[in-house]
């Protein structure tokens, strides 16, 4: 059957932990992505940012997992109003910020 939302979120959190701890070299060669507002709709916004990073196998699973939280199809070059379009940060910092926010959402029971 379908994975419960709480399990899916926990698995996403654990995948982000794996990414942050396994990096010897800069994550995705130090690629920069648009920062996002960590509010409603931020799963799609996070995917929109990360999908523009190509050739980085370390985040491919994260991209797939985020697509499960986003109700619409996301493609490269697509941007929502949730992006802070004047601020780019390294993928590693993006992942750390997203991870901390998701842990707080999990605590609050916001699984979707």
């Amino acid at each position: 059957g379908p994975v419960p939302p709480s399990t899916a979120l926990r698995e996403l959190i654990e995948e982000l932990v794996n990414i942050t701890q396994n990096q010897k070299a800069p994550l995705c060669n130090g690629s920069m992505v648009w920062s996002i507002n960590l509010t409603a709709g931020m799963y799609c916004a996070a995917l929109e940012s990360l999908i523009n990073v190509s050739g980085c196998s370390a985040i491919e699973k994260t991209q797939r997992m985020l697509s499960g939280f986003c109700p619409h199809k996301v493609s490269a070059g697509q941007f929502s109003s949730l992006h802070v379009r004047d601020t780019k940060i390294e993928v590693a910092q993006f992942v750390k910020d997203l991870l901390l926010h998701l842990k707080k959402l999990f605590r609050e029971g916001q699984f979707n």
Epitope: V17, R107, G109
Partner: antibody
């Protein structure tokens, strides 16, 4: 100011019962999850249990499950810990502590009482 | 049940930086809180949610949490920082709160 004050500690024989109380003041007691944490002499902190802000749920450490019961009276701003079938290993300073209530209560304990000593000895 | 591992003791000279670690399986997936306890006193929250600091706690205290290790860092250590420090998490699987064994910080 915000305060938690425990009372009811003392010396009790193994197998007997004891009830600890915690009086809260200076904050909106009914909006906080409330915990008991204990510390055996010379040892580290051990979580005992929690009661949700509205008293609707309790959770306990395995070491006290079935023996200890946490209750609260939001009209009187009081928290209680009923301890039955006490054992020597229950000897400790018992602290009450508050934590903002979330859905899954994974919060920090941001206010602690001064503690009350419980000694279980024959 | 979930286990948190801390070094029993850490020693540091005044003015130096103290680093206290808290190890646990995928602890990075959990929100970690840190408490300071001085002899004969109740614990005091010094870091919550991995890296946030209560308003009354000096900026010298900071926290991080990556992978299997959470870290409490105290920079420019003072004699008054001498205390026991405990990390703590909530374990989703057992629905219980877990403390590390504690680390005694000695200021030389």
């Amino acid at each position: 100011q915000m305060q938690l004050v425990e009372s009811g500690g003392g010396v009790v024989q193994p197998g007997r019962s004891l009830t600890l109380s915690c009086a809260a003041s200076g904050f909106e007691f009914r909006t906080y999850g409330m915990h008991w944490v204990r510390q055996a002499p010379g040892k580290g902190l051990e979580w005992v249990g929690v009661i949700w802000y509205d008293g609707s749920a309790t959770h306990y450490a395995d070491s006290v499950k079935g023996r200890f019961t946490i209750t609260r009276d939001n009209s009187k701003n009081t928290l209680n810990l009923q301890m039955n079938s006490l054992r020597a290993e229950d000897t400790a300073v018992y602290y009450c502590a508050r934590a903002p209530q979330w859905y899954l209560t994974a919060e920090a304990f941001d206010l602690w009482g001064q503690g009350t000593m419980v000694t279980v000895s024959s | 049940s979930y286990i948190l591992t801390q070094p029993p003791s850490v020693s540091v000279a005044p003015g130096e930086t103290a680093t206290i670690t808290c190890g646990g399986n995928l602890i990075g997936a959990k929100l970690v809180h840190w408490y300071q306890q001085k002899p004969g006193q109740a614990p005091v929250l010094v870091i919550y949610d991995d890296s946030d600091r209560p308003s009354r706690i000096p900026e010298r205290f900071s926290g991080s949490n990556i992978g299997n290790t959470a870290t409490l860092t105290i920079s420019d250590v003072e004699a008054g920082d001498e205390a026991d420090y405990y990390c703590q998490v909530w374990d989703y699987y057992s629905d219980t709160y877990v403390f590390g064994g504690g680390t005694k910080l000695t200021v030389l």
